[in-house]
């Protein structure tokens, strides 16, 4: 057999013994002689090691350019390819010989020593296990341990070929610690040397940059990349890096194993790129490759390199932001420049600092924007290398869409008699104010519930049809003036009035104002009665702990079965903007209460009290007339406020004070408290008695010492009283210089 | 007698590279394979690798792939192992092994190991 | 790779008594298990190997046993020249890896 191509004029060495393959028997002597045209050498089997001090190379007798190779007793382990070929040529020629030797049938190498196979866990790999045949025709089988199995040639995955070993499907014994092949010739078993099997894992999962993007550097900075590959087991790994710049003179790799997890299922390995001093040129993408052999993976990231430190405000950036109360608003500082400038936000020149509502960083963010929220942002970017500053100016307007004061309060349910000239008003808070302020009605019994109708908290009115106040057809007369502008708890509010001329009928009004980011509106209950009025004796507000009456006066000619209620503990719910259910239609939410009866020339008089009052008993009371012709029912509500009983206390401090004789003291001592504190003073714990120069004013709120004297040093004290309980504040008046002696001593 | 005689103790700075000597003698030293172990400060033994004395052929664990490389000198009877890019983590005492026979994976003979101490 | 998981991490025991140190395996060993002793500031010494089978040398004191994922190593007598770490070792899959060591001690 010839190997290589030939070159000019040359053929190929002759060998004595023209075959490709010989077989000879154990114990005779090989020998062949190889002519040619220039000098020849010998390679054999074997020849790297001990063997050859029994091979002989010698010069032929009858001619230049040839050489005879002869081993006397050959054995099993000289079995292999015997080539002969031109010195510093691909030029030769090839036999392979079997040496039959059935005491060795395995070529071995002269030690035992394991040998290594190397394997992957792919189903589709196989692998060789080099235990090659002095015979070529042996019945060999390969034996795995531990547990022990044997794996015979299966004419098809699994095969034994003298010249290359046992071929087997890598995975089939990638669970085996080792290997080797075994023989059978005569009943007798032949071991080849062991094999170690070495699993190769080959698998990469994911190689990552680090820093992954946006890597900016100004030139003669360092410039540091790390790549990581994550591999399955029995994985090496071998990186490989692609830059802009390959003739980098401060360029530095170190690769490392990185250590994991004992048990884990997964290696680590990390290669690091280090160029010193970076240039213009080192401007690009980098590619780091890692490489297991059989898979290759790879990441890229673009380095940018600038000639020195800069900061510039980006062209996105906004100058007003418009946001609505709520919203959360988000101010972003766009930039250039490098490295990141260090960024500051000033609100009317104050410094902002973060909270948890407001997050001032890259982005401005503001969680819930409130009105108070609304002025002039200032952003400073400065660069932390050359300390260039940059500033803007972000103007944030907040708007605000209509508010009507009226509605935080609870919804006025009273009644208004008949025939009376009522106003209703609408206080309307925007930002920006209210482009209009529409008012609408509807009759009130188009919009009574019957207790069979189902009613949604979100709706409880069946009714829709508003209609505009310009059509006051079937309803009270109504005059809508102009709009007035009051600046009202520091705020420009804008004010609606509606004038019914003559409460005649009961109806729902609803004032609507819309400005550009909303709208809100206010439904009043306009129940109109002509009977029953409710009075209260003694206060309009009483304490609790107090004693309160309620009067229900209606005229006895009209009206019979006079009735106090209480809504009930869970009326229907009164929402923002909704309206308060006419309580004559639906008697279920109401409590009838005990009330005593007294009359006088005309009227009769239904007084319901309470002794004690407690803040429980603050609520909607409903007094019920009957008409003794069309026995219509008659309501009239009044809304009762119990005021909690409250200990004294003082505010403000008295404070210790030096006066010359002969000048004025004036001091205050303003208390609070339910029920209203007596307020007595003291001086050195003896009570204060007024004179010609000691006053008195104010529910002795004002104490004023005219034309003080020595005498009137010492500890002034004032308390505050109530059945609740006393406050006290003390001071100390200090009088200087002597006393004049007056000419009446 | 089997002996196998490692070289002495080294200090290296990080990102040295330091060679271990193992002499062997009383056998045949291309009959058997050389094994390397490990064994940091106060810890266990850590199998490393081995090579085959009769063709060169280095097979290193998976935690020592890269940075170490084992070689022979027949001649000498000599194995070494060298571990380049020092780190402080690499501080321990090197053991030189060899097995008792070609069949079983234990070691029967043992260096008395070289201690590597690195320090900056 | 295969675990080696060594128990107890060290131990102390009189002259004479009986002492035992379990190894167990992450993977069936199938007896591929050899035991070392290493005396302080000393290269480890080979004791058993195949699990059970006494190295040249060795008193007759140590003795090794088990299948499957647990071994052990028994001392029937301890003996104050006892005095070191034991570990095990697999060979039956490549990397051939090491016990954590138990440490024994006289009382």
């Known amino acids: 057999a010839s190997v290589g191509l030939p070159s000019v004029s040359l053929d190929l060495p002759r060998l004595s013994i023209q075959k490709d393959i010989l077989t000879i028997k154990a114990n005779t002597t090989l020998q062949i002689t190889c002519r040619g045209q220039r000098d020849l050498d010998w390679l054999w089997p074997n020849n790297q090691s001990g063997s050859e001090q029994r091979v002989e190379v010698t010069e032929c007798s009858d001619g230049l350019f040839c050489k005879t190779l002869t081993i006397p007793k050959v054995i099993g382990n000289d079995t292999g390819a015997y080539k002969c070929f031109y010195r510093e040529t691909d030029l030769a020629s090839v036999i392979y010989v079997y040496v039959q030797d059935y005491r060795s049938p395995f070529i071995a190498s002269v030690s035992d020593q394991h040998g290594v196979v190397y394997i992957t866990e792919n189903k589709n790999k196989t692998v060789v296990i080099p235990c090659l045949g002095s015979i070529s025709n042996l019945n060999v089988s390969l034996c795995a341990r531990y547990p022990e199995k044997r794996f015979v040639p299966d004419g098809n995955r699994i095969s034994w070929d003298s010249k290359k070993g046992f071929t087997i499907p890598s995975y089939m014994i990638s669970y085996a610690g080792m290997v080797f092949c075994e023989a059978k010739i005569n009943d007798e078993s032949y071991q080849s040397i062991m094999y170690i099997v070495v699993v190769v894992g080959y698998r990469i999962y994911d190689v990552v940059l680090s820093p992954s993007h946006g890597i900016e550097l100004s030139v003669g900075e360092k410039l540091v990349l790390n790549c990581t590959a994550r591999t399955e087991l029995n994985v090496g790994i071998d990186f490989n890096w692609e830059y802009p710049s390959s003739k980098h003179q401060h360029k530095k790799l170190v690769n490392r194993d990185l250590k994991t997890q004992s048990g884990s299922e997964m290696k680590k390995f990390l290669s690091t790129l280090t160029i010193d001093g970076v240039t213009r040129s080192d401007q690009g993408l980098y590619t780091c490759a890692a490489s297991s052999g059989l898979m290759t993976k790879k990441n890229s990231t673009f380095v940018r390199v600038h000639e020195k430190p800069f900061v510039a405000f980006g062209s996105g950036m906004e100058s007003l932001v418009e946001a609505t109360v709520g919203e959360r608003v988000r101010i972003p500082a766009k930039y250039l420049g490098y490295p990141p400038p260090e960024i500051k936000w000033y609100k009317n020149g104050i410094p902002l600092e973060s909270n948890h509502t407001i997050k001032a960083g890259h982005v401005l963010t503001i969680m819930e924007v409130s009105e108070r929220d609304t002025g002039n942002y200032t952003v400073i970017l400065t660069n932390p290398i050359s300390k260039e500053k940059q500033s803007h100016v972000v103007s944030l307007v907040v708007y605000v869409p209509p508010q009507i004061g009226e509605k935080s309060l609870i919804s006025p349910v009273d009644s208004y008699q008949y025939g009376t000239t009522q106003t209703l008003t609408c206080t309307v808070y925007a930002i920006p104010p209210p482009h209009h302020i529409h008012w609408y009605w509807q009759l009130e019994e188009e919009c009574a519930n019957e207790p069979s109708q189902a009613v949604s908290v979100t709706n409880p009115y069946p009714c829709e049809e508003w209609r505009s106040v310009e059509d006051f057809q079937g309803g009270n007369k109504i005059e809508v003036n102009k709009n007035q502008f009051a600046l009202i708890e520091g705020k420009n509010k804008t004010v609606s009035t509606l004038v019914i001329q003559a409460a005649n009928v009961s109806a729902l009004y609803k004032c609507e104002a819309v400005n550009k980011v909303g709208r809100g509106e206010r439904v009043i209950s306009f129940h109109v009665t002509r009977g029953p009025e409710i009075t209260l004796q003694p206060d309009m507000q009483p304490t609790e702990q107090e004693s309160v009456s309620l009067w229900c006066t209606a005229d006895r000619s009209t009206f019979e079965n006079l009735t106090w209620y209480k809504l009930g503990p869970q009326p229907l719910p009164i929402h923002v903007g909704e309206l308060p259910t006419p309580v004559c239609k639906n008697l279920d939410t109401l409590w009838k209460l005990n009330a005593t009866m007294f009359s006088n020339s005309t009227n009769d008089i239904l007084i319901m009290e309470l002794k004690n009052a407690s803040l429980q008993d603050q609520g909607d009371y409903v007094c019920l007339a009957q008409d003794r012709k069309t026995k219509k029912r008659h309501c009239v509500v009044r809304q009762l406020t119990v005021l909690e009983r409250v200990a004294p206390t003082i505010t403000g401090n008295l404070e210790n004070q030096t006066t010359s004789i002969g000048e004025s003291i004036e001091v205050s001592c303003t208390a609070s408290g339910n029920p209203p504190p007596q307020i007595m003073w003291f001086k050195d714990n003896e009570t204060l008695v007024e004179d010609s120069g000691i006053v008195l004013k104010d529910g002795n709120r004002n104490l004023t010492i005219r034309r003080v004297r020595k005498e009137d040093e010492g500890l002034y004290t004032c308390q505050a009283c109530s059945v609740l309980g006393c406050a006290k504040v003390e001071a100390f008046f200090i009088i200087e210089g002597a006393q004049e002696k007056t000419n009446l001593e | 007698e089997v002996q196998l005689v490692q070289s002495g103790a080294e200090v290296k700075k990080p990102g040295a590279s330091v060679k271990v000597s193992c002499k062997a003698s009383?056998?045949?030293?291309?009959?058997?394979?050389m094994y390397w172990v490990r064994q940091a400060p106060g810890q266990g033994l850590e199998f490393m690798g081995w090579i085959n004395t009769e063709t060169g052929q280095p097979t290193y664990a998976d935690d020592f792939k890269g940075r170490f490389t084992f070689t022979l000198d027949t001649s000498t009877s000599t194995a070494y192992m060298e571990l380049r890019s020092l780190r402080s983590d690499d501080t321990a005492v090197y053991y030189c092994a060899r097995l008792g026979n070609n069949y079983g994976i234990w070691f029967a003979y043992w260096g008395q190991g070289t201690l590597v101490t690195v320090s900056s | 790779d295969i675990q080696m998981t060594q128990s107890p991490s060290s131990l102390s025991a009189s002259v004479g008594d009986r002492v035992t140190i379990e190894c167990r395996a992450s993977d069936d060993l199938y007896s591929t298990l050899a035991w070392y002793q290493q005396k302080p500031g000393k290269s480890p010494k080979l004791l058993i190997f195949?699990?059970?089978r006494l190295a040249a040398g060795v008193p007759s004191r140590f003795s090794g046993s088990g299948s499957g994922t647990d071994y052990s190593l028994t001392i029937s007598s301890l003996q104050p020249e006892d005095v070191a770490t034991y570990f095990c070792q697999q060979y039956n899959k490549f990397p051939w890896t090491f016990g954590g060591g138990t440490k024994v001690e006289i009382k």
């Open positions: 195949d699990a059970n």
């Open positions: 009383g056998y045949t030293f291309t009959n058997y394979g």
